[in-house]
């Protein structure tokens, strides 16, 4: 039977060396044996390159396309074949569909005055455009309490936050994730962190009494 | 050492057909675009046409199109330039360049970093 | 097409002086920061062209540091400082960016 896609591919680049795009087909597609995305700069000289799909789902096929930095003037021309057949055909600018890389190493330390530090690290190297561009949101939640979280942003350039123990319930195990976005590109939010978790031991100044 | 020496350029007549050489050595030729160069006689360059390290994508200008084919041969590390219905108008020196470096997603670019001899082509009745 | 004009057409320096050559472009060369896509070129008599800047400001290989290009998006400039005998030829600006790729008439530089 004939082949088609269901929901276009959709696309994002972290701006710096992967581009990937997301589709749906109408039914269970094996998509590295049945599909290939090619994808080529729309600059003189460039070669035609092929990536090849992996599933996500049944029917949802996802492609990784390395990239060189990104430059907002790239533009790239993407096809979508099922061997011969020409399914899709787009251009895709990473500059204005920029999800950026997800933060690292997201640590907690306690610090003075019963205070805790969250820590993360910038996914950016320095040189990169998006490195002195991200904001970041911290989502901390009681990890009995579904109803306890509080969710934190932090829009000046450190990659950390201060948290104040008597916020958070005394005794209560507490975990925290990171996410970041890039105002100046209009991105999407990446990728949540993994999860790092912690307990809280504040006592309350009643307590001292 | 890198070099490039052109080879074909004779006198045809109107009409008639030329294939221009040029064979490279001392660089890794697969991974670069070519470029053909021309210069009429006491006249300025003129960018004839570029043709990607693979051979997939080439390019050429208003001038030649449809009339001139540019081709490569990477296991003989030789450029083509395929002129037919030549013209008067066509007669120059034409020379080969090394351009960009092809095998990056975006090319890197050096300009026309190593040119050949250049080979005369004359068209005249 | 992307049109490409340099000025002046001739030039005379004296040996030692400086020479300067303009390039203009009929559109911005700047692909992105610090990548404009303008080239130099010098023609010897009875020579092929040869590189001598690429991307308007990067020297090529074995250009000496007399050679200096600069601009960006549609001026741009070819300095060459403590002009030599062998500086004479012809010198051309082309536009790397996008096909066709573009020369500039050229710029005789004749020393007294």
């Known amino acids: 039977g004939s082949v088609k896609v269901l929901h276009e591919p959709s696309c994002f680049s972290d701006y710096i060396s992967t581009s990937v795009c997301q589709w749906k087909m109408d039914h269970p597609t094996n998509c590295s044996a049945e599909l290939r995305l090619s994808y080529q700069l729309d600059f003189m000289g460039s070669e035609n390159h092929t990536c090849v799909p992996e599933n996500r789902e049944d029917s949802v096929c996802v492609c990784s396309m390395p990239i060189d930095d990104a430059v907002e003037a790239d533009v790239y021309q993407l096809d979508l074949w099922a061997g011969q057949q020409l399914l899709w055909s787009g251009s895709f600018q990473p500059s204005k569909h920029v999800k950026p890389r997800t933060p690292g190493n997201l640590t907690v330390h306690p610090n003075i005055s019963h205070t805790w530090l969250l820590m993360w690290t910038n996914p950016y190297p320095t040189e990169n455009h998006l490195h002195s561009e991200l904001t970041y949101m911290v989502n901390v939640s009681n990890d009995n309490d579904p109803e306890d979280f509080k969710v934190y942003n932090v829009t000046y350039m450190g990659p950390t936050l201060r948290l104040a123990a008597s916020t958070l319930k005394s005794g209560a195990s507490y975990s925290a994730r990171v996410r970041a976005w890039a105002q100046t590109y209009n991105s999407t939010w990446s990728d949540w962190s993994p999860s790092t978790t912690w307990l809280n031991y504040y006592e309350p100044w009643e307590q001292h009494l | 050492e890198v070099q490039l020496v052109e080879s074909g350029g004779d006198l045809v007549k109107p009409g008639g057909s030329l294939r221009l050489s040029c064979v490279a050595s001392?660089?890794?030729?697969?991974?670069?675009?070519m470029t053909w160069v021309r210069q009429a006689p006491g006249k300025g360059l003129q960018w004839v046409s570029l043709?990607?390290?693979?051979?997939?994508?080439?390019y050429y200008a208003d001038a030649v199109k449809g009339r001139f084919t540019i081709s490569r041969d990477n296991a003989k590390n030789t450029l083509y330039l395929q002129m037919n219905s030549l013209r008067a108008e066509d007669t120059a020196v034409y020379y080969c360049a090394v351009d960009r470096l092809t095998k990056t997603i975006r090319p890197q670019y050096y300009g026309l970093w190593v040119w050949g001899q250049g080979t005369l082509v004359t068209v005249s009745s | 097409d992307i049109v490409m004009t340099q000025t002046p057409l001739s030039l005379s320096v004296s040996p030692g002086e400086t020479a300067s050559i303009s390039c203009r472009s009929s559109q911005s060369l700047l692909y992105s920061i610090g990548y404009n896509y303008l080239d130099w070129y010098l023609q010897k008599p009875g020579q092929s062209p040869q590189g001598l800047i690429y991307?308007?400001?990067k020297r090529a290989s074995g250009v000496p540091d007399r050679f200096s290009g600069s601009g960006s998006g549609t001026d741009f400039t070819l300095r060459i400082s403590r002009v030599e005998a062998n500086d004479t030829g012809v010198y051309y600006c082309?536009?790397?960016?996008?096909?066709?790729?573009?020369f500039g008439q050229g710029t005789k530089l004749e020393i007294k």
């Open positions: 991307l308007g400001s």
């Open positions: 082309m536009q790397g960016l996008q096909s066709p790729l573009t």
């Open positions: 043709i990607s390290g693979s051979g997939g994508k080439t």
């Open positions: 001392g660089f890794p030729f697969r991974d670069f675009a």
